[in-house]
């Protein structure tokens, strides 16, 4: 299953499959997730080691048993790959690192006014993988405001140095935020020239394209079909690059297919997994296990659940079958692709779905009436769980926020439905940033069921929580994916990085905002909160947040939206925007429904019709 916990002051001994430099443990974990054999990682922050060569070292590890011995190492951080973790799997990494220079091949230098502008330039450059920016206070005047665009053979820095007044980060192309645009078409009977960066075997051109998209240096590819004239090159997928970023030439060639990486696509990237099953095809590789199962789909599920399994072949040969069950060969290789692909066989083959980010129709959890005042504009994909609940009567308007917690589930405030309990009048918009982008053609979700907490009473602040079941499940993308829920009765975690988002009023007597707003607000103890609201009962099932001096808060139109906190690199839904005295008033914190206190209720209500809890637990 999915294991998200990080181990501090611990280092996994042995099992090394690769090493690189990364700026933090989260980026190291992401590299582990996308490495075909990595199950575990250990990261050495600069503070943890004197050896300059090992500072920022990220060590990717494999283990036949799925675990390795941990040794104590002060400052080190270790953890697990996020393979099998559904929507948490993403190659997108937005963080900017202050006081750090990520080294690589500097291929472009320009003057810019901010680190955000530098990141944008990197994202809009086809070859840029990461960047460094010298701030206005950099010690050498001639380098100030320099934006250095960089790449390296592996896509990670060749070294990372602590350097004052320098800020570094990665391209946001994996966040589907590039302005370059992409070529979706693939070209039959055409071969591209230029430099081959890797060679893998794939069953079709689409798998080849996805591998190219997630390879750090692949810009385009050529695939040789299984009737290519040279037998040893059949099903070969050549991943390619060039200085210019485009093929310098292409040759008409029977039985070849060429195309481009989709990393520069805006708003949509392919999933980093291959879900199709190939009938009449055998995938060769190192044998991991052989098991008898009923049907090719069960074979694929078995492979997906066995974390080291990369691909499989389900054999229908009479000697491989007994009764209704046949042999399911679970396999792996060094690069995650088959070492041999054979056609015209009595097998069906496919890949593990361990890197698919759709997961099942579940809500995500983890084991361990009110716009934003004083906030700032959000950016695309920053809060992908945020939804807008709109009502269409004669006109259409935004009424509340909500949080996507599963393919078919939204969590919001019960009071949003006061006087409007009819599901037909509601439209739910997900994956949006600007309300003005919504037109009559913008897709929206309709409500199948509104589930209001049984103890909620109109005009009371208690149990202000409701679930919405959508009529059809939503696909997950970088701009539309769920927020994880806290564990039941979560009281031990101390959250220090919490944000409220919404399109609500920017002042008490204001109006709905166009761009989704965000505000960083500290949590307030319930004791402190009760002092500020002596006429109301602040229960243990509420959580408060706000600044003593006011000025930043949720407001009308934010109701039902999320209060999220980041802990160990993972966002969790801590509260649902509920109520408050005015907006952003001094010593009047916002009051939120405490999600951890309602976990039993959420789980009970999101159970599927067959009684199986639709629950995805990443830990």
């Amino acid at each position: 299953g999915c294991l998200t916990q990080l181990y501090e002051n611990a280092f996994f001994r042995g099992g090394d499959v690769a090493s690189m430099y990364t700026p933090n443990a989260q980026y190291c974990q992401m590299r582990c997730t996308f490495h075909p054999r990595c199950l575990l990682f250990s990261f050495l922050p600069a503070s943890s080691i004197n050896d300059m060569e090992k500072r920022f070292g990220c060590f990717l590890k494999d283990s036949v048993t799925g675990t390795l011995p941990k040794v104590h190492r002060t400052g080190a951080v270790s953890g697990h790959s996020l393979k099998q973790c559904g929507h948490q799997i993403s190659a997108c990494h937005r963080d900017i690192y202050k006081g750090v220079d990520m080294r690589g091949v500097n291929f472009n230098v320009s003057k810019v006014s901010s680190v955000e502008e530098c990141q944008k330039r990197c994202t809009s450059n086809i070859r840029c993988q990461f960047f460094s920016y010298a701030t206005q206070t950099f010690h050498k005047a001639e380098y100030r405001n320099n934006c250095l665009l960089k790449y390296s053979p592996g896509g990670t820095p060749t070294a990372i140095k602590v350097l004052s007044n320098v800020e570094s980060g990665f391209s946001l192309k994996p966040c589907a935020l590039s302005e370059i645009g992409c070529h979706m078409n693939i070209f039959q009977h055409l071969a591209f020239s230029d430099v081959d960066v890797a060679r893998v075997l794939t069953p079709d051109a689409f798998v080849c394209r996805t591998i190219c998209t997630y390879h750090p240096n692949c810009l385009f590819f050529t695939f040789y079909t299984n009737v290519w004239k040279i037998e040893s090159q059949r099903n070969v997928c050549l991943l390619k690059t060039s200085e210019s970023g485009t093929p310098s030439s292409s040759t008409p060639q029977e039985n070849t297919i060429s195309g481009y990486s989709l990393l520069t696509c805006k708003r949509t990237l392919p999933e980093p997994c291959h879900s199709k099953i190939y009938p009449g095809v055998d995938f060769g590789g190192e044998e991991l296990n052989v098991t008898f199962v009923k049907g090719v789909n069960v074979c694929q599920e078995t492979c997906t659940k066995m974390i080291r399994c990369q691909f499989f072949t389900y054999s229908l040969l009479p000697e491989d079958c007994k009764e209704e069950k046949c042999k399911c060969f679970l396999r792996l290789s060094m690069d995650g692709s088959p070492t041999r692909i054979a056609y015209g066989t009595q097998g069906s083959s496919g890949y593990s779905l361990r890197l698919c980010n759709t997961g099942d129709n579940s809500v995500c959890t983890t084991k361990t009436s009110t716009r934003i005042v004083g906030g700032t504009n959000s950016s695309w994909g920053e809060w992908p769980w945020q939804v807008s609940l709109q009502v269409k009567l004669t006109a259409q308007r935004h009424l509340c926020g909500g949080s996507l917690i599963g393919h078919q589930w939204v969590l919001t405030a019960a009071h949003c439905f006061d006087g409007l309990p009819l599901q037909d009048v509601w439209r739910i918009y997900s994956g949006i940033l600007n309300l003005s982008d919504i037109t009559k053609d913008t897709p929206f979700s309709q409500i199948k069921e509104i589930i209001i907490h049984q103890n909620y009473k109109v005009s009371e602040g208690n149990h202000d929580i409701a679930l919405i079941k959508l009529q059809a499940p939503l696909n997950y993308t970088e701009f539309q994916k769920p927020i994880c829920l806290p564990s039941k009765g979560d009281t031990s975690t101390i959250y220090t990085n919490c944000w409220v988002t919404g399109w609500g009023f920017s002042k008490e007597k204001g109006e709905i905002q166009n761009i989704l707003q965000k505000v960083n607000i500290p949590l307030v103890t319930n004791e402190e909160c009760q002092k500020r609201y002596q006429d109301y009962k602040i229960t243990q099932r509420m959580v408060c947040a706000g600044y003593k001096e006011g000025g930043k808060d949720a407001c009308k139109g934010d109701s039902g939206g999320p209060l999220v906190c980041k802990h160990n690199g993972m966002w969790r839904l801590v509260g649902i925007t509920s109520w408050g005295e005015g907006c952003a008033r001094r010593e009047q914190p916002g009051v939120y429904t405490k999600v951890a206190e309602y976990m039993d209720w959420i789980l009970e209500k999101t159970q599927s019709s067959d009684g199986k809890a639709q629950m995805q637990s990443p830990a």
Partner: antibody
Framework: EVQLLESGGGLVQPGGSLRLSCAAS????????MVWVRQAPGKGLEWVSS????????LYADSVKGRFTISRDNSKNTLYLQMNSLRAEDTAVYYC?????????????WGQGTMVTVSS | DIQMTQSPSSLSASVGDRVTITCRAS??????LNWYHQKPGKAPNLLIY???SLQSGVPSRFSGSGSGTDFTLTISSLQPGDFATYYC?????????FGGGTKVEIK
């Protein structure tokens, strides 16, 4: 020229049998997986059966399983569909098609079709 | 089995119009979605495979998009030869089901 040509259709009584053939030319037939697709009069398309390039792997729609058999003779560049226990609902134009290579199994080359009528 | 739902079932348009046909799969099929058109009395003809890739010889006014469950076929400027019935079909897993078809007629 790449071509598929079906034959063997006709009128048959319920419970009867028929064997359809599909002759391929202009491409390396033995390298391609092949399919049969049918279309009832005035209706949409329905996939019937698939066969791997060497003939060892076959798949059928539930509606024909146990009654129809797909086969091929690569030495004759010919695809077959043996249809037994025919029913009125099997009345349709039957098309053979090849599955594209490396392009995700779309049906890229189609024959012109042969009409099968099951009626008493 | 995966169901394919096409909409609309028919539409009337004029030469030069931009036409959009949608297809929805009952479960995610990745990009393994193909579009065909068929004229009366003729065999179907592959237009788009893999959701967005144009089959060789097909005019560039045809384009496809989508992934997962929702797909679109767009004809940017309808030509006289484009009046036909259009089918979507998935090639994700067997049975390879087709949509019910969309008949594009002259207005």
């Amino acid at each position: 020229e790449v071509q598929l040509l079906e034959s063997g259709g006709g009128l048959v009584q319920p419970g009867g049998s028929l064997r359809l053939s599909c002759a391929a030319s202009g491409f390396t037939f033995s390298s391609y997986a092949m399919v049969w697709v049918r279309q009832a009069p005035g209706k949409g398309l329905e996939w019937v059966s698939s066969i791997g390039s060497s003939g060892g792997f076959t798949l059928y729609a539930d509606s024909v399983k146990g009654r129809f058999t797909i086969s091929r003779d690569n030495s004759k560049n010919t695809l077959y569909l043996q249809m037994n226990s025919l029913r009125a609902e099997d009345t349709a134009v039957y098309y053979c098609a090849s599955m594209n290579l490396g392009g995700g199994d779309a049906f890229d080359i189609w024959g012109q079709g042969t009409m099968v009528t099951v009626s008493s | 089995d995966i169901q394919m739902t096409q909409s609309p079932s028919s539409l009337s348009a004029s030469v030069g119009d931009r036409v959009t046909i949608t297809c929805r799969a009952s479960q995610s099929i990745g990009i393994y979605l193909n579009w065909y058109h068929q004229k009366p009395g003729k065999a179907p003809n592959l237009l788009i495979y893999g959701a967005s890739s144009l089959q060789s010889g097909v005019p560039s006014r045809f384009s496809g998009s989508g992934s997962g469950t929702d797909f679109t076929l767009t004809i940017s400027s309808l030509q006289p030869g484009d009046f036909a019935t259009y089918y979507c079909q998935h090639s994700y897993s067997t049975p390879f089901t087709f949509g019910g078809g969309t008949k594009v007629e002259i207005k």
